[in-house]
Interface confidence: low
Amino acid sequence: ARNGDRCPLGPGRCCRLHTVHASLEDLGWADWVLSPREVQVTMCIGACPSQFREANMHAQIKMNLHRLKPDTVPAPCCVPASYNPMVLIQKTDTGVSLQTYDDLLAKDCHCV
Amino acid sequence: ARNGDRCPLGPGRCCRLHTVHASLEDLGWADWVLSPREVQVTMCIGACPSQFREANMHAQIKMNLHRLKPDTVPAPCCVPASYNPMVLIQKTDTGVSLQTYDDLLAKDCHCV
C-alpha cells in the first residue's frame, strides 16, 4: 500500500469504505421505492489524518491550514471518490419503473 | 434562493466558500514554490444540515442514516463541488517553471 493508505491511527480508523445495512424506512424511501426493501449502503467513514488518501492539492492545503488554524479550518473529510450505480424499482402513477442511480453507493473513498 | 441554499442555522454558518489568507510557509510550499508568496485560499467550510446543498442521492442517504445512527454514520460534510485553476511559479533545477493546478482553489461547495 502507498504511504497515503497506511492509517496512523490504527486499523480501520481512517477514511475507508463502510457498509451500513438500511431498510427503505431508514432511508426515507418507503413511499416511493418498491425494491430493494433493504440496501447495503456503502459509504465513506473515518478520520483524515495528514497525507492519508489526500484527494488533491486542495486537501493538502486544507490539512496544513487546519494544523495552523484548527478553529477556523476543519480537517479534510472522508467522501466518495467514485460511485457504483444502483437500480431502484420505483412506484409510479401507472405502476412501476426501473431507475438507475449513479451517485448512490460509494465505490471508494478519499479525503478532501 | 433554492430551499437547499437557505441555512437553517443562521447566516454564514452552513457550508459555503470561505477565503483564508495563507503564506507559502503556512501551506508548506516554501521549499518548492517561488510565487505567489501569499495566497487567498478559497475553501469549503460550514455545517451540512438536512437538505442543505446536498450534492447527490448519496448525501441524502447519509443524512437520513446519520439521524438514525449518529454514532456510526457522520453527517454529510462540506467539500468543493468544483475548483478554479491556479498557476504556481515553481523552483526547478534549471530555474523556474509555471505549473497550472486545476484542483487547488475551491470554486463552489456542496454537502456530501
Partner: antibody, heavy 117, light 110 residues
C-alpha cells in the same frame, strides 16, 4: 503559441460607444484572469480593470463607463460615453497567476482608439 | 485606491552604468509589485514579479527589491538594449485596491 490579438479600435465621436475585443489563442481563457490597460499617446500605462473567475474589478476612475466581459475565447472591453481623453492604445494582458497577486505576463500588441469630433 | 509614485521620471546613463529606479506605494502592498519594460511602439514586457522574482528569459543584470511601500529596480550594468521606459505596478487586489501603474521612468542614452 500563446497569443493575444486586440481589435475594434478606430475613430469614434465623443459620446459614442465602442467594444474592443481581445482574441486569445494557445491557451484556455477559462484558466486565467485577464486585464485591460491603456496608454494615451506619449503617456504612461493606465490599468483599467481585470476579469477574474468570479467577477470583475475596475480602477476607480473606470467604474461605470468601462465594462469587461468574456466568452470562451475572447475578452471584451465595452467603453461608453467616450471622451477625447479616452484616446489611447488599449492593451489586453494575461495575468501570470492568480490567488493573491496579479502580474501581467502576456500582452497583445494593442488597438488604437481615437475619440475626436 | 493605491497610488504608485515612480522616480526619477527620466534619467540619462551610459552603457555599463548601474541604474536604480524607485517606486513608492501610497500604502503597504507587501511584496506584490511587478516591473515592466516598454520600448516605443511595443507592448510592455514583464521583468520582475513579486518585487524580486525575475520573469522567464530576463537577464540577471535586472534585479528587484523592496517590500511594504518602497521598491527598487536595479540594472547592474546597462546594455544598449536596456534603453526604454520602465514601469512599476501594484498587483494587490485582495481588498479591491486595483492594480495601478507608476508614472514610468524613461532611461535615455547620455
Amino acid at each position: 503559441e500563446v497569443q493575444l490579438v486586440e481589435s475594434g479600435g478606430g475613430l469614434v465621436k465623443p459620446g459614442g460607444s465602442l467594444r474592443l475585443s481581445c482574441a486569445a489563442s494557445g491557451f484556455s481563457l477559462s484558466n486565467y484572469y485577464m486585464s485591460w490597460v491603456r496608454q494615451a499617446p506619449g503617456k504612461g500605462l493606465e490599468w483599467i480593470g481585470m476579469i477574474s473567475f468570479s467577477g470583475t474589478t475596475y480602477a476607480t476612475w473606470a467604474k461605470g463607463r468601462f465594462t469587461i466581459s468574456k466568452d470562451s475565447s475572447t475578452v471584451y472591453l465595452q467603453i461608453n460615453s467616450l471622451k477625447t481623453e479616452d484616446t489611447a492604445v488599449y492593451f489586453c494582458a494575461r495575468v501570470v497567476y492568480a490567488g493573491w497577486t496579479y502580474p501581467l505576463g502576456i500582452w497583445g500588441q494593442g488597438t488604437l482608439v481615437t475619440v475626436s469630433s | 485606491d493605491i497610488q504608485m509614485t515612480q522616480s526619477p521620471s527620466s534619467l540619462s546613463a551610459s552603457v555599463g552604468d548601474r541604474v536604480t529606479i524607485t517606486c513608492q506605494a501610497s500604502q503597504s502592498i507587501s511584496s506584490v509589485l511587478s516591473w515592466y519594460q516598454q520600448k516605443p511602439g511595443k507592448p510592455p514586457k514583464a521583468l520582475i514579479y513579486e518585487a524580486s522574482i525575475l520573469a522567464s528569459g530576463v537577464p540577471s543584470r535586472f534585479s528587484g527589491s523592496g517590500s511594504g511601500t518602497d521598491f527598487t529596480l536595479t540594472i547592474s550594468s546597462l546594455q544598449p538594449e536596456d534603453f526604454a521606459t520602465y514601469y512599476c505596478q501594484a498587483n494587490y487586489d485582495v481588498y479591491n485596491y486595483g492594480n495601478p501603474f507608476g508614472g514610468g521612468t524613461k532611461v535615455e542614452i547620455k
